[in-house]
């Protein structure tokens, strides 16, 4: 699997940001489809449990996530993007995503480190 | 087979209310955030709705907001759009759209006339 | 809210020929944009996605191209069947925009 993200993400506290990540594959999409998002702090503590799709999505029970991710994900378009809702400054960090598609279980995980601001200062500003 | 069907629409008056429905059939629905389009007389295409999975966050154009409601029932397979203080711009075949667009509907048309 | 451009407006053409709309897009959109086919009487159809992908069972006389504010629809030889209207739409930023139309015609 091949994954492409934008790798770097500016967006303002309060808002929602969409953080994109699509694939390839040699194998075609099914129902073993598999996406695992994960998110690194910037002050080094330890990886937190953000998202999991397979089929179905699954929302994060507990934690800094809960009630503020969304899957926005499409296999058919090869889409295995999410929604997060109201930025806070502590989410800035990197979020990784995993996808396997078995037989084609194996890649480079994709990685979008997100800089959550006060105010916009460049046009890389993802809504949605 | 992926199917979307609208329904709902019809002849409203200015500040009328409209609801409008749209059946979801051959895809896992709860899985997929979904929209509704609108298309003007003049042919214009307009996003008027979005829902996402979940907890069903949801998002408006700056013309419709405060008086569109999008929600939907997973259980049911259905995708709404309430619609509220109608003015005779919201004049339109209205579609409801997997995810960013992937599929539509056929439509059901709107029409905001006294 | 971004202005999707979109050129032509209509294109008469024969069949066999090649044909090019674009879209500009009023700021960077990365390549978060789709095209769409609209035939007489139907709704749209996905055609194009992420700019350059094209969707399941689209044949591929049609491409897209372009990334930031510049995108190019192709169809590398229409036949009768492509008369429609083809929109372009951006879906970076909300409020989601779409471009004005082009109606292709077949002499």
């Known amino acids: 699997v091949e994954i492409y993200t934008s790798r770097v993400l500016e967006a303002v506290n309060g808002t929602d940001a969409r953080l994109k990540c699509t694939f390839s594959s040699f194998a075609p999409v099914g129902d073993a489809l598999t996406v695992t998002w994960n998110f690194r702090p910037l002050d080094g503590g330890p990886e937190q449990f953000v998202f999991y799709y397979h089929i179905d999505p699954f929302q994060p029970m507990s934690g800094r996530f809960k009630d503020r991710v969304s899957w926005d994900g499409n296999p058919e378009r090869y889409d295995a993007s999410i929604l997060l809702w109201k930025l806070q400054f502590d989410d800035n960090g990197t979020y990784t995503c995993q996808v396997k598609n078995p037989p084609d279980v194996d890649g480079v995980i994709g990685e979008i480190r997100l800089s959550v601001v006060h105010t916009v200062r460049f046009s890389e500003i993802h809504f949605l | 087979e992926v199917k979307l069907v609208e329904s709902g629409g019809g002849l409203v008056q200015p500040g009328g209310s409209l609801k409008l429905s749209c059946a979801a059939s051959g895809f896992t629905f709860s899985s997929y955030t979904m929209s509704w389009v609108r298309q003007t007389p003049e042919k214009r295409l307009e996003w008027v709705a979005y829902?996402?999975?979940?907890?069903?966050?949801?998002y408006y154009p700056d013309t419709v907001k405060g008086r569109f409601t999008i929600s939907r029932d997973n259980a049911k397979n259905t995708l709404y759009l309430q619609m509220s203080s109608l003015k005779s711009e919201d004049t339109a075949m209205y579609y409801c759209?997997?995810?960013?667009?992937?599929?539509w509907g056929q439509g059901t048309s709107v029409t905001v006339s006294s | 809210s971004i202005v999707m451009t979109q050129t032509p407006k209509f294109l008469l053409v024969s069949a066999g020929d090649r044909v090019t709309i674009t879209c500009k897009a009023s700021q960077s959109v990365s390549n978060d944009v789709a095209w769409y086919q609209q035939k007489p009487g139907q709704s749209p159809k996905l055609l194009i996605y992420y700019a350059s992908n094209r969707y399941t069972g689209v044949p591929d006389r049609f491409t897209g191209s372009g990334y930031g504010t510049d995108f190019t629809f192709t169809i590398s030889t229409v036949q009768a069947e492509d008369l429609a209207v083809y929109f372009c739409?951006?879906?970076?930023?909300?409020?989601?925009?779409f471009g004005g139309g082009t109606k292709l015609e077949i002499k």
């Open positions: 829902i996402t999975t979940g907890a069903g966050r949801t």
């Open positions: 739409q951006q879906d970076y930023s909300s409020p989601w925009t």
């Open positions: 759209a997997r995810h960013r667009g992937d599929y």
